[in-house]
Interface confidence: low
C-alpha cells in the first residue's frame, strides 16, 4: 500500500519522496532494500538521502530497484517503499508509455498542463516545453510558473507534452525532463442560426479604382465544434471559383476563431486592381449551417479622391 513507482532517465536528476509522510522534525532513514544497506546523507555522494527525499544526481540505470524509507518519530515508525526505475535515454522521438506521467485533459476554458514532479526540485525559470519532441513556439503557448497555458485550445493540441528544466544542487546543474499526455475535451456546445457579424446588410464599401480591396465575411454559428458550418462569397449569385475573374479571389481556408466562446468563421474576398466594372457587381456574404442560410449583400462605390484647389 505504501509503495510508489518512480522513474527517470539516465544522466538526469531524479528526486523521490518517501510515500510515508511525517512532520519535518521526524527523521527519515533510507535503505536499498535488496542489500538493506543504508543510503548516505552526505551530499558529496551521487545518490544520497535528504530527509523525506532520495536524490539521484544524476541517475544511472544501475540505480533501479526498491528503496525503503522509515519515518521515525518518538512514538512510532512508518515504513514506505519507493520502486525506482532508471531508463536509458531514447534515441528517437517517441516517449514510451512507461515514461509517461498521468494524462491531463483540457478545454477551451482550461488548458493548463502542469510539469509533473517539478515541485520536488530546486528549479528556476525558464521552463522549456516540447510537444511530440518539437519546441513549442508562438504566442498561443505561455510557460507560466510550473505549468504551460495554451490559448484557444483546439483538438490538434492533443499530444505528448514534455517539460524540461534544470535542478540546482549546491551550484551543480542537472537536467530533468518529464512527459505527459494532453487530451482536449469539447465543452458542451450548441448550434444556432448563423449570425453574420460583418459585413452589415446592404453595406456600401468605398474602394479606390486601381487599388486592392478586401471584404471580410464573418459569421458565428454557436458554441463548440460545429459539424456543418461555412462562410463564402458569391458574385452576382455565382461561386467565386466559377465566376472566372482571377483578380477576385477568396482567401481559401477559413479561419476558425472563438469570440466570446462562439465558433466563428471568416472568409476574406480579395479584389486586386479594382476596376470600374467591379462596382456593378453584387457581393454576397453567405453563412450557412444545419439551421439554414443567411446572406448579407455588399456593393462597392468609388472613393472620390479629395480635390486639391489652389
Amino acid at each position: 500500500k505504501f509503495s510508489k513507482q518512480s522513474w527517470g532517465l539516465e544522466n538526469e536528476a531524479l528526486i523521490v519522496r518517501c510515500p510515508r509522510q511525517g512532520k519535518p522534525s521526524y527523521t527519515v532513514d533510507w535503505y536499498y532494500s535488496q542489500t538493506n544497506k543504508s543510503i548516505p546523507t552526505q551530499e558529496r555522494n551521487r545518490v544520497f538521502a535528504s530527509g523525506q527525499l532520495l536524490k539521484f544526481l544524476p541517475a544511472a540505470v544501475a540505480d533501479s530497484g526498491i528503496y525503503t524509507c522509515i519515518v521515525r518519530s518518538p512514538t512510532f515508525n512508518r515504513t514506505g517503499y519507493a520502486n525506482v526505475t532508471i531508463y536509458k535515454k531514447q534515441s528517437d522521438c517517441n516517449v514510451p508509455d512507461y515514461l509517461m506521467y498521468s494524462t491531463v485533459s483540457g478545454s477551451e476554458k482550461n488548458s493548463k498542463i502542469y510539469c509533473p514532479t517539478i515541485d520536488l526540485y530546486n528549479w528556476t525559470a525558464p521552463l522549456e516545453w516540447f510537444k511530440n519532441c518539437q519546441a513549442l513556439q508562438g504566442s498561443r503557448y505561455r510557460a507560466h510558473k510550473s505549468f504551460l497555458v495554451i490559448d484557444n485550445v483546439m483538438t490538434e493540441d492533443a499530444g505528448d507534452y514534455t517539460c524540461k528544466f534544470i535542478h540546482n544542487e549546491n551550484g551543480a546543474n542537472y537536467s530533468v525532463t518529464a512527459t505527459r499526455s494532453f487530451t482536449v475535451k469539447d465543452e458542451q456546445g450548441f448550434s444556432l442560426f448563423p449570425v453574420i457579424g460583418a459585413p452589415a446588410q446592404n453595406e456600401i464599401k468605398e474602394v479606390e479604382i486601381g487599388k486592392n480591396a478586401n471584404l471580410t465575411c464573418s459569421a458565428c454559428f454557436g458554441k463548440g465544434t460545429q459539424f456543418l458550418a461555412a462562410v463564402l462569397w458569391q458574385l452576382n449569385g455565382t461561386k467565386i471559383t466559377d465566376f472566372g475573374e482571377p483578380r477576385i479571389q477568396q482567401e481559401e481556408g477559413q479561419n476558425q476563431s472563438f469570440s466570446n466562446g462562439l465558433a466563428c468563421l471568416d472568409m476574406v474576398l480579395r479584389i486586386a486592381d479594382v476596376k470600374e466594372e467591379d462596382l456593378l457587381l453584387q457581393y454576397d456574404c453567405l453563412a450557412l449551417n444545419l439551421h439554414g442560410l443567411r446572406r448579407h449583400t455588399v456593393r462597392l462605390s468609388r472613393k472620390n479622391p479629395i480635390d486639391h484647389h489652389s
Epitope: 461561386k239 467565386i240 466559377d242 472566372g244 482571377p246 483578380r247 482567401e251 481559401e252
Partner: antibody, heavy 117, light 110 residues
Framework: EVQLLESGGGLVQPGGSLRLSCAAS????????MNWVRQAPGKGLEWVSA????????YYADSVKGRFTISRDNSKNTLYLQMNSLRAEDTAVYYC??????????WGQGTLVTVSS | DIQMTQSPSSLSASVGDRVTITCSGD??????VSWYQQKPGKAPKLLIY???NRPSGVPSRFSGSGSGTDFTLTISSLQPEDFATYYC????????????FGQGTKVEIK
C-alpha cells in the same frame, strides 16, 4: 494536412486511352480550382488543364484540346483526367495541383504515363 | 502560345552566393507570377505566390519582386539544400485562368 495522390498512370499504345485520378484530402475540395500539369522526362513543366471548384468551367492547353477531358467528383474528393488518342509526346509524369491565390500551392507526387508501341 | 521567358536556363553558384533568376512575358499583359522549386524525382514546391508573397514555411532567403513584364526570384544566401531547378509560373489577371510555365533554371554547385 493537405494531400493529393495521383493514380492511373501506366504504359499505353499510341492512340490508346487512360484515365488518371487524383484523390484529395485534408481540405474542402469543392472550394478549390484544380489543375493537371505534366513533365516529360528530362524536360520542364507544362500546364495541361484546369477545372473550377464546382466543375462548371474547364480549360485546356492547345496541345491536348479535344483529346483530354478534365472532370471532378466533389462527393468523392477526386479529380480526373480522361486522356484519349494518346501520342508519344504525351509521355510524362502527370501532377495534379491545387489552385490558391493564383498559384499552385499543393502538388501530388505524380503518376507516370508512357505512350509507346 | 505565349511563353514565359526564364533566364538563365542554368547557373553555377556556391553556398552563400546571392542568386537571381528572372522571368518575362511581355505579351501576357498584367499577370500574377509564382515561383517553384523542384528537386529530381519530386513534385514542385511553391516558394512565392502573387509576385512577392512567401507561404509559411518557406525560408526568408527566398524573395520575389517585379511587376508588369519582368519578375525576379532572389535567393539571398544560397544554402546546400537550394540546389534544384526553379520555375516561374504566370497567370493572367484578366481572361482565361491558364497558367504559363517558364522553361526552368537549374541551379548547380560551382
Amino acid at each position: 494536412e493537405v494531400q493529393l495522390l495521383e493514380s492511373g498512370g501506366g504504359l499505353v499504345q499510341p492512340g490508346g486511352s487512360l484515365r488518371l485520378s487524383c484523390a484529395a484530402s485534408g481540405f474542402t475540395f469543392s472550394r478549390y480550382a484544380m489543375n493537371w500539369v505534366r513533365q516529360a522526362p528530362g524536360k520542364g513543366l507544362e500546364w495541361v488543364s484546369a477545372i473550377s471548384g464546382s466543375g462548371g468551367n474547364t480549360y485546356y492547353a492547345d496541345s491536348v484540346k479535344g483529346r483530354f477531358t478534365i472532370s471532378r467528383d466533389n462527393s468523392k474528393n477526386t479529380l480526373y483526367l480522361q486522356m484519349n488518342s494518346l501520342r508519344a509526346e504525351d509521355t510524362a509524369v502527370y501532377y495534379c495541383a491545387r489552385v490558391w491565390r493564383n498559384s499552385l500551392d499543393y502538388w501530388g507526387q505524380g503518376t507516370l504515363v508512357t505512350v509507346s508501341s | 502560345d505565349i511563353q514565359m521567358t526564364q533566364s538563365p536556363s542554368s547557373l553555377s553558384a556556391s553556398v552563400g552566393d546571392r542568386v537571381t533568376i528572372t522571368c518575362s512575358g511581355d505579351r501576357l499583359g498584367e499577370k500574377y507570377v509564382s515561383w517553384y522549386q523542384q528537386k529530381p524525382g519530386k513534385a514542385p514546391k511553391l516558394l512565392i505566390y502573387e509576385n512577392n508573397n512567401r507561404p509559411s514555411g518557406v525560408p526568408s532567403r527566398f524573395s520575389g519582386s517585379g511587376s508588369g513584364t519582368d519578375f525576379t526570384l532572389t535567393i539571398s544566401s544560397l544554402q546546400p539544400e537550394d540546389f534544384a531547378t526553379y520555375y516561374c509560373v504566370a497567370r493572367a489577371v484578366r481572361g482565361n485562368p491558364h497558367v504559363l510555365f517558364g522553361q526552368g533554371t537549374k541551379v548547380e554547385i560551382k
